[in-house]
């Protein structure tokens, strides 16, 4: 499959730097090479390397980061890094994280407002429903795979010796004690933020205070704002606001155009940041390895648990998700995955699906031919609610802890773990180590001890990265699947399902290119049947 050159909103081939290192105006051969085609002659090899330069640099960066980290931690002596030196060492990586986080807010808000405003409400609902169904099913599959692997490999029984070395009380203070109900109420509260400005950097969370009520000590839930972007609330607001703007018709067009332009400008910034990504990733990975005190001992003690998590992630990411993609699209899923290697490596480096979002949007649009209105609508939602990796890890961890503490798991408990992991992974909301916090909810739900969460935390630096890679891969494949659904629906129907708002059209009329025509865009036909005139205003819902 050779991808067509991506187009900008004017229907012209974009001439900005792309995710794969070349320009979007590269020749068809280059496009083929970029999409994972074969490189034969020396010329083709050169073109292939140029087209995949960023991908190669990113992969090299991860490997170099591991090597650098092991080298520095192994050297010791004069090279030994204290806390102050370590922060200087990881500074290039910190810079990447800051750049990516800087871009998240405008990107998520503008892309979702623009995406929701450019879609017919009915189709928006259908698209959202299919996306959520895909996310739900894949997360459940990941959970089931996690439980199955852990029951088969028995990592807890093999790792029981670690109990002896961590002491009887494995630091239960690390385990957040929160009622299951309060966790889900907090999730609902965050969906409807009371202050949009503070939602950009704070989330709502319930804590507990002990109060004396009639001589009895009672644990009273107390709400407070905690550090960390409430991405869930911003996503919901942006979608609803986009739908509202569309309802305004011509009056809302100026604002829609503003958000679309803002979004395009943000994506230009992303394309610049992408070239810095390999440097940042290298130092993030190296820094984390240097930070670990005794990686070898950790692997010796928790090796089977780590293996279980990583094997689960590998099976789900390299077999299950690609198989689902192939069954529905009949396209090569590994070619699709090749197109998103850079964001996958960034996910590994940053350990945050939110931070990977900008690069993922760029790559799925330019390398994998996913339409902007789909990627910019689906990916932010996916980054917020689709947590295959987290669900799988939580299930493995729950079974691991059950085995470690010799607590039985009957059928009801296993189902409870599956359902709770699937539901609570939604609440993890793309923040690093969010999975460990929601793990406590699962353990409480099936009465398992929370003492051993400290063991999970010990290897979270590695498992969480693997989780993030799987999370963002699921988002991207979801976007690819929906693109295929849209293409199929369009080819079946003579009257496409969606209306494109006027603001999506260029100021000077140009024929709408075939790439932009899709079932999510309704065009009113001119006298000659040309789909050149977009509706002035959608019909009122």
């Amino acid at each position: 499959m050779v991808a067509d050159p991506p187009r900008d909103s004017k229907g012209l081939a974009a001439a900005e730097p792309t995710a794969n290192g070349g320009l979007a105006l590269a020749s068809i051969e280059d496009q083929g090479a970029a999409a994972g085609g074969y490189c034969g002659s020396r010329d083709q090899v050169r073109r292939c390397l140029r087209a995949n330069l960023l991908v190669l640099l990113t992969v090299v960066a991860v490997v170099a980061g591991v090597a650098l980290g092991l080298g520095v931690s192994g050297a010791g002596g004069a090279l030994a890094l204290g806390p102050e030196r370590l922060s200087a060492f990881v500074f290039p990586g910190e810079l990447l994280l800051r750049l990516l986080r800087m871009i998240i807010l405008p990107l998520v808000v503008c892309s979702l407002i623009g995406g929701a405003a450019s879609l017919d409400p009915g189709a928006l609902g259908r698209l959202g429903a299919w996306a959520l169904l895909f996310f739900l099913v894949t997360t459940l599959l990941a959970s089931a795979l996690g439980v199955g692997l852990a029951l088969a490999l028995q990592p807890g029984a093999a790792s029981a010796a670690i109990n002896a070395s961590v002491g009887a009380a494995g630091s239960a203070e690390n385990a957040p004690s929160k009622e299951v109900l309060d966790s889900f109420l907090d999730l609902a509260r965050n969906i409807f933020p009371s202050n949009l400005v503070s939602a950009a950097f704070r989330s709502y969370s319930t804590t507990y205070e002990e109060r004396n009520i009639t001589g009895t000590r009672v644990k009273v839930p107390v709400g407070q704002e905690v550090e960390g972007m409430n991405i869930l609330g911003l996503v919901v607001f942006a979608i609803v606001f986009g739908v509202a703007l569309r309802k305004l018709g011509p009056e809302g067009e100026l604002l829609i155009r503003f958000f679309n332009s803002f979004n395009e400008a943000t994506m230009v910034l992303v394309s610049w940041i992408m070239w810095y990504a390999p440097v940042g990733i290298m130092f993030l990975v190296a820094g984390k390895i240097v930070e670990m005190e005794d990686v070898g001992l950790l692997f010796a003690r928790l090796g089977k648990y780590i293996l279980c998590c990583l094997l689960g992630h590998a099976i789900h990411g390299l077999l299950v998700l690609p198989l689902i993609y192939f069954l529905f699209t009949r396209k090569n899923p590994y070619r699709f995955l090749w197109g998103i290697v850079t964001p996958l490596a960034t996910a590994f480096g940053t350990s945050s699906s939110s931070a990977t979002l900008p690069l993922m949007m760029k790559c799925v649009e330019e390398n994998n031919g996913v339409a902007k209105h789909i990627s910019r609508f689906i990916l932010p939602i996916g980054a917020t609610v689709n947590m295959d990796g987290a669900a799988l890890f939580q299930c493995v961890a729950a079974v691991f802890i059950a085995q470690l503490s010799q607590q039985s798991l009957d059928f009801v408990k296993i189902i409870t773990i599956l359902v709770t992991a699937t539901a609570s992974s939604v609440g993890a909301a793309g923040i690093p180590a969010g999975g460990v916090l929601t793990l406590a909810i699962i353990l409480e739900a099936v009465n398992l001890p929370v003492d051993h969460i400290s063991l999970i935390l010990a290897v979270d630096w590695l498992v969480d990265r693997s989780c993030t890679v799987l999370n963002v891969e699921g988002d991207a494949l979801g976007a690819g699947l929906l693109q295929n659904y849209v293409d199929r629906t369009e080819s079946r129907s003579t009257e496409p399902e969606l209306i494109q708002v006027k603001s999506e059209l260029p100021l000077d009329p140009l024929p709408v290119p075939t790439e932009e025509g899709n079932p999510l865009l309704k065009h009113y036909r001119g006298p000659a049947g040309d789909a050149t005139v977009a509706s002035e205003k959608e019909s009122v819902m």
């Epitope: 029981a160 010796a161 002896a164 004690s177 002990e210 503490s405 010799q406 607590q407 039985s408 003492d451």
Partner: antibody, heavy 120, light 107 residues
């Protein structure tokens, strides 16, 4: 029915070792953890630790690291508590107790207890 | 470690009386509170686990309640065989810890 039968009372001199056994019957031995609990004369109950009967791994309470060793012989469904270099303050009744496989940490069946007296 | 405090440390009651023993944890233990009965020279026996669940073979006159930090064991109508020492134990976090015991004597 579930039964835990412990070895008989022991009278030992300070510095000597002692080994207490606890034979389990009426259930699958390797499914439930086995805990050890100490009760000094006229005192309350004190959890010493437990042994993972499937993996054979002992987990000791903070006050019972060093001279105390938990072990198993799964072929005869028996758990052992060995104390080396006995001291006068080790005089107590030692109970083995089956750790429930549910609701975290509690002990649903207990052995009858083994009295260990350390006296010169 | 979590401290468990029982009250009273001893109490006298008559056959047929309703008796309540309380147990307080130094921190929230949710419902992971268990009660044991021990008679002189005998091993402890589990009565109630997870705050209110009766262990098999335990008479229904025994009941438990509470949540968080404050718990109670109630014997609705004392029988002669109920005179013993009762211990509460938290099972929330390692290490499991016991209360100092409540000795129930005949008045």
């Amino acid at each position: 029915q579930v039964q835990l039968v412990q070895s008989g009372s022991e009278l030992k001199k300070p510095g000597a070792p002692v080994k207490v056994s606890c034979k389990a019957s009426g259930y699958t031995f390797s499914t439930f953890g086995m805990s050890w609990v100490r009760q000094a004369p006229g005192q309350g109950l004190e959890w010493m630790g437990w042994i993972h009967t499937y993996a054979g791994v002992p987990i000791y309470g903070d006050d019972f690291k060093g001279r105390f060793v938990f072990s198993l012989d799964t072929s005869v469904s028996t758990a052992y508590l060995q104390i080396s270099s006995l001291k006068a303050e080790d005089t107590a009744v030692y109970y083995c107790a089956r750790r429930s496989d549910n609701y975290r940490y509690f002990f649903d069946y207990w052995g009858q207890g083994t009295t260990v007296t350390v006296s010169s | 470690d979590i401290q468990m405090t029982q009250s009273p440390s001893s109490l006298s009651a008559s056959v047929g009386d309703r008796v309540t023993i309380t147990c307080r944890a130094s921190q929230d233990i949710r419902n992971y509170l268990n009660w044991y009965q021990q008679k002189p020279g005998k091993a402890p026996k589990l009565l109630i686990y997870y705050t209110s669940r009766l262990h098999s073979g335990v008479p229904s006159r025994f009941s438990g309640s509470g949540s968080g930090t404050d718990f109670t064991l109630t014997i609705s109508s004392l029988q002669p065989e109920d005179f013993a020492t009762y211990y509460c134990q938290q099972g929330h976090t390692l290490p499991p810890t016991f209360g100092q015991g409540t000795k129930l004597e005949i008045k």
